[in-house]
Interface confidence: low
C-alpha cells in the first residue's frame, strides 16, 4: 500500500537561523532558475519507514561572506522507499533537495539499478527559488508499468565536484505469473517415461504450478515453481499444459502435443525421371514420418519377365534426397519398382509399385573378321567386316563407327567415320603416305556405341610402290592382329 500526500512546495533552509563562521567567499551571482508556477508536486511517503535516518552521500558547502553563515551539508529529503503496484498502472515518484543559491549549474539525474536513465524517460525537474535557497523537486513518471520497470531508482546531484545521492526508491511491479519455461512438444516412444518442465515467476511470489493433461488436472496439490512432471508413459497422443497461480491470479501455458512415435506411412508418388540401358532414376514423395525422422529407404526392384526367377533386388539409400538411381539393370527390360522407408520404430509398408523400362543397351560385341587392304588406285583403303551377333537387349543396329589412325614420322591423327547398318564395307581416303593406318570398328545401336574390334594395321607405302595384300583381324585364338603389307 502507498500513501500519497500533497503539500505546498515551500522552499526552506536546511537549518533555520544564522550559524557562526568566518570563511570568506565571493557571493555575487545568485542561482537564476525558472520557476514553474502553479505546480503542486505529488510527494510520496512510505508509512512503514517514517523519519528514517538519512544514509546517503552529503556535500559540505562553503561559507558565504554575506552574514557569515556556515551552510550545513546538502542531502536529499527522505521520500517514499518502496512502491508496489500492478502491471499497466501509472506511477510517479520524486526526490527533493534545497540548495543554497550560491551554487550554480546544479543538475539532477535519475539512475536505475546503477545505470543512468537517459533519453525518452518522463523526468521533470522543477525549481522554486527563495532568498537564500532554491528547492528542487525531480519527478519521475512511468505510464503503464511493466515488469521490466522493477528496480531501485535514485537521484544524483553533482555540486562542487561532489556527488549527492538520494535514498533508493524500490519499484515492485506485480502481476499474473510470467512463464520463463513452458513445456515443449515432444515425440515419445510408446510406454516410455519422459519429463515436462514448467517455470513461472512473479512478483508476487510464490508461484504455484498445476499440470493439466487433456483438459484434466494431473496433480491435486500444487507444486512450487519450477515444476517437473514425470509422465510414466503414454499409449496415445496427449495434450499437456501447466497453470501458474499467484496472488494476482492464474496464467495458463501453451498446450503442447505429445505424439507417440510409430512406423512411417509408405512413400507415395514414385516417379521415373530418367531411364537408360542399365539404370533408372526414380524419385518419391515421403509418407508421414510417424513422428520420428526417416533414417533410410529401401528401393525394391523386381524384373517383370515370365522367364525371370521373381527375385527382388534391394537397394538401400539415404532418406534424403528422395531420389535414387537404380543401377546394374538389364537393357531393354521391364521392372516393377517400390520404395519403403524406415525410422527408429521400423519400416513402412512398400509404396504402390510402378512399372518402368530400361532402354536399348549398346552392343556388347564388336564386328567380326575385319579386313583392310589398299585398293589398286592406292587412293583408298578398303575395309570389310561381318555383322556382330548382338543380343536382343542391345536393340536394333543403326550403323557402325570406324576409327582409323594414321601414323608416320612425327604425325599421328585419328579420324572417325560413321556408316549405315546395311553396310559391311567402307572405303576411306588415304590420309598420309609412307605411314601406318590402324583400323578399328564398333557397332552402334540407339543404346550407344559397342566395343571396338581389335586393331588392324596396314602400311601405306610411298607413291609408286604397289601391294594389294590385305590385313585382317586374327583368327580366334591368335594373340596379335595380323599385319600384311
Amino acid at each position: 500500500a502507498i500513501t500519497e500526500a500533497r503539500e505546498e512546495a515551500k522552499p526552506y533552509p536546511l537549518f533555520p537561523g544564522p550559524l557562526p563562521g568566518s570563511l570568506q567567499t565571493d557571493h555575487t551571482s545568485l542561482l537564476s532558475l525558472p520557476h514553474t508556477s502553479g505546480y503542486q508536486p505529488a510527494l510520496m511517503f512510505s508509512p512503514t519507514q517514517p523519519g528514517r535516518p538519512y544514509t546517503g552521500n552529503v556535500a559540505i558547502p562553503r561559507v558565504t561572506s554575506a552574514g557569515s553563515k556556515l551552510l550545513p551539508p546538502l542531502a536529499f529529503k527522505h521520500t517514499v522507499g518502496h512502491i508496489i503496484l500492478s502491471e499497466h498502472k501509472d506511477v510517479k515518484f520524486n526526490c527533493s533537495i534545497s540548495v543554497p543559491n550560491i551554487y550554480q549549474d546544479t543538475t539532477i539525474s535519475w539512475w536505475k539499478d546503477g545505470k543512468e536513465l537517459l533519453g525518452a524517460h518522463h523526468a521533470i525537474t522543477q525549481f522554486y527559488p527563495d532568498d537564500e535557497v532554491t528547492a528542487i523537486i525531480a519527478s519521475f513518471s512511468i505510464t503503464s508499468v511493466q515488469r521490466s520497470d522493477n528496480g531501485s531508482y535514485i537521484c544524483k546531484m553533482k555540486i562542487n565536484n561532489e556527488e549527492i545521492v538520494s535514498d533508493p526508491i524500490y519499484i515492485e511491479v506485480q502481476g499474473l505469473p510470467h512463464f520463463t519455461k513452458q513445456p515443449e512438444s515432444m515425440n515419445v516412444t510408446r510406454n516410455t517415461a519422459f519429463n515436462l518442465t514448467c517455470q513461472a515467476v512473479g512478483p508476487p511470489e510464490p508461484v504455484n504450478i498445476f499440470w493439466v493433461q487433456n483438459s484434466s488436472r494431473v496433480n491435486e496439490q500444487p507444486e512450487k515453481s519450477p515444476s517437473v512432471l514425470t509422465v510414466p508413459g503414454l499409449t496415445e497422443m496427449a495434450v499437456f499444459s501447466c497453470e501458474a497461480h499467484n496472488d494476482k491470479g492464474l496464467t495458463v501455458s501453451k498446450g503442447v502435443q505429445i505424439n507417440i512415435k510409430a512406423i512411417p506411412s509408405p512413400p507415395t508418388e514414385v516417379s521415373i525421371h530418367n531411364s537408360t540401358a542399365h539404370s533408372i532414376l526414380i524419385s518419391w514423395v515421403p509418407g508421414f514420418d510417424g513422428y520420428s525422422p526417416f533414417r533410410n529407404c529401401s528401393v525394391q526392384v523386381k524384373e517383370v519377365d515370365p522367364l525371370s526367377n521373381g527375385s527382388v533386388m534391394i537397394f538401400n539409400t539415404s532418406a534424403s534426397p528422395h531420389m535414387y538411381q537404380i543401377k546394374q539393370l538389364q537393357a531393354l527390360a521391364n521392372y516393377s519398382i517400390g520404395v519403403s522407408c524406415m525410422n527408429e520404430i521400423g519400416w513402412s509398408a512398400v509404396s504402390p509399385w510402378i512399372l518402368a523400362s530400361t532402354t536399348e543397351g549398346a552392343p556388347s560385341v564388336a564386328p567380326l573378321n575385319v579386313t583392310v587392304f589398299l585398293n589398286e588406285s592406292r587412293d583408298n583403303v578398303d575395309i570389310r567386316w561381318m555383322k556382330p551377333l548382338t543380343k536382343r537387349q542391345a536393340g536394333e543396329l543403326v550403323g557402325y563407327r570406324i576409327s582409323h589412325v594414321w601414323q608416320s614420322a612425327g604425325i599421328s591423327k585419328e579420324l572417325l567415320e560413321e556408316v549405315g547398318q546395311n553396310n559391311s564395307r567402307a572405303q576411306i581416303s588415304v590420309q598420309v603416305h609412307n605411314a601406318t593406318c590402324t583400323v578399328r570398328i564398333a557397332a552402334v545401336t540407339k543404346g550407344g556405341v559397342g566395343p571396338f574390334s581389335d586393331p588392324v594395321k596396314i602400311f601405306i607405302p610411298a607413291h609408286g610402290w604397289v601391294d594389294h595384300a590385305p590385313s585382317s583381324t586374327p583368327a580366334p585364338g591368335n594373340a596379335d592382329p595380323v599385319l600384311i603389307i
Partner: antibody, heavy 125, light 112 residues
Framework: EVQLQQSGPELVKPGASVKISCKTS????????MHWVKQSHGKSLEWLGG????????SYNQRFQGRATLTVDKSSSTAYMELRSLTSDDSAVYYC??????????????????WGQGTTLTVSS | DVVMTQSSLTLSVTIGQPASISCKSS???????????LNWLLQRPGQSPKRLIY???KLDSGVPDRFTGSGSGTDFTLKISRVEAEDLGVYYC?????????FGGGTKLEIK
C-alpha cells in the same frame, strides 16, 4: 513436314480439370520426347513437364507435380496434358513442343525445335 | 532452379541496323559433356515460339545467317547484323543444361 496440332480454346470453372491434346505428324512419334510449356498472359514461358513415348516415362517441373498428368496415345501419335484443381492462375496459353531424339528426359539437350499453335485456357466462374 | 535474366525488356531498332540481345544465367550452362545447352527462341506477334539457335551458336535450318549466337558460361548474346521487319517479336533465351529447363523473361524487339 513436322506438325503439332493442338485442341481448341477451353473455358472452365475453378476447381475443375482440363485435358489438352496435341496431334503430331511428319516424324516418328516414339523417337522424340514431347514437352508442355505454359505462357501466362504477357509473361514469359515456363516448362511444365515432358513425356518420353518410347519408354512411357514422364518428368515434371515440381511446381506442377501432382496437378499435371502427361499421357500419349501411340496409335494416333497424340500427346495429352491434363491439369487438375484449376485456379485463375492457370489461365494461360499452353504449348506442346517436341524434344530431342534422346532417351532421357533429364539429360541436357536442345529441346523444343517444333511447337504447336497453342491452346488458350481460361479459368473463370 | 537456374534463373535466366534478359536485362532489356524492350529494344527499339531501325530496320537495317544491327541489334544485340543479352542473356545471363545464375550458374554456368557448360555441361559435363563439354556442351553448353543455351538456346534462343523467337515468338512473333500472335504466333507460337520458333527455335532460332541451339548450342549457343548453331542456327536452326531455315534461320537466316544474319543471326549469330555467342557466349559461354553464364553470359550469352544474340546478334542480328541487319534487322528486317520479319525479325520483330519477343526473343527468349532458355537453358537445357540444368533440370528443370528454364526460360528468360524475353526481350521485345520493336521498330523505332
Amino acid at each position: 513436314e513436322v506438325q503439332l496440332q493442338q485442341s481448341g480454346p477451353e473455358l472452365v470453372k475453378p476447381g475443375a480439370s482440363v485435358k489438352i491434346s496435341c496431334k503430331t505428324s511428319g516424324y516418328t512419334f516414339t523417337e522424340y520426347t514431347m514437352h508442355w510449356v505454359k505462357q501466362s498472359h504477357g509473361k514469359s514461358l515456363e516448362w511444365l513437364g515432358g513425356f518420353n513415348p518410347n519408354n512411357v516415362i514422364t518428368s515434371y517441373n515440381q511446381r506442377f507435380q501432382g496437378r499435371a498428368t502427361l499421357t500419349v496415345d501411340k496409335s494416333s501419335s497424340t500427346a495429352y496434358m491434363e491439369l487438375r484443381s484449376l485456379t485463375s492462375d492457370d489461365s494461360a496459353v499452353y504449348y506442346c513442343t517436341r524434344g530431342d531424339l534422346l532417351w532421357s528426359l533429364l539429360l541436357p539437350g536442345n529441346y523444343f525445335d517444333y511447337w504447336g499453335q497453342g491452346t488458350t485456357l481460361t479459368v473463370s466462374s | 532452379d537456374v534463373v535466366m535474366t534478359q536485362s532489356s525488356l524492350t529494344l527499339s531498332v531501325t530496320i537495317g541496323q544491327p541489334a544485340s540481345i543479352s542473356c545471363k544465367s545464375s550458374q554456368s550452362l557448360l555441361d559435363s559433356d563439354g556442351k553448353t545447352y543455351l538456346n534462343w527462341l523467337l515468338q512473333r506477334p500472335g504466333q507460337s515460339p520458333k527455335r532460332l539457335i541451339y548450342l549457343v551458336s548453331k542456327l536452326d535450318s531455315g534461320v537466316p545467317d544474319r543471326f549469330t549466337g555467342s557466349g559461354s558460361g553464364t553470359d550469352f548474346t544474340l546478334k542480328i547484323s541487319r534487322v528486317e521487319a520479319e525479325d520483330l517479336g519477343v526473343y527468349y533465351c532458355w537453358q537445357g543444361t540444368h533440370f528443370p529447363w528454364t526460360f528468360g523473361g524475353g526481350t521485345k524487339l520493336e521498330i523505332k
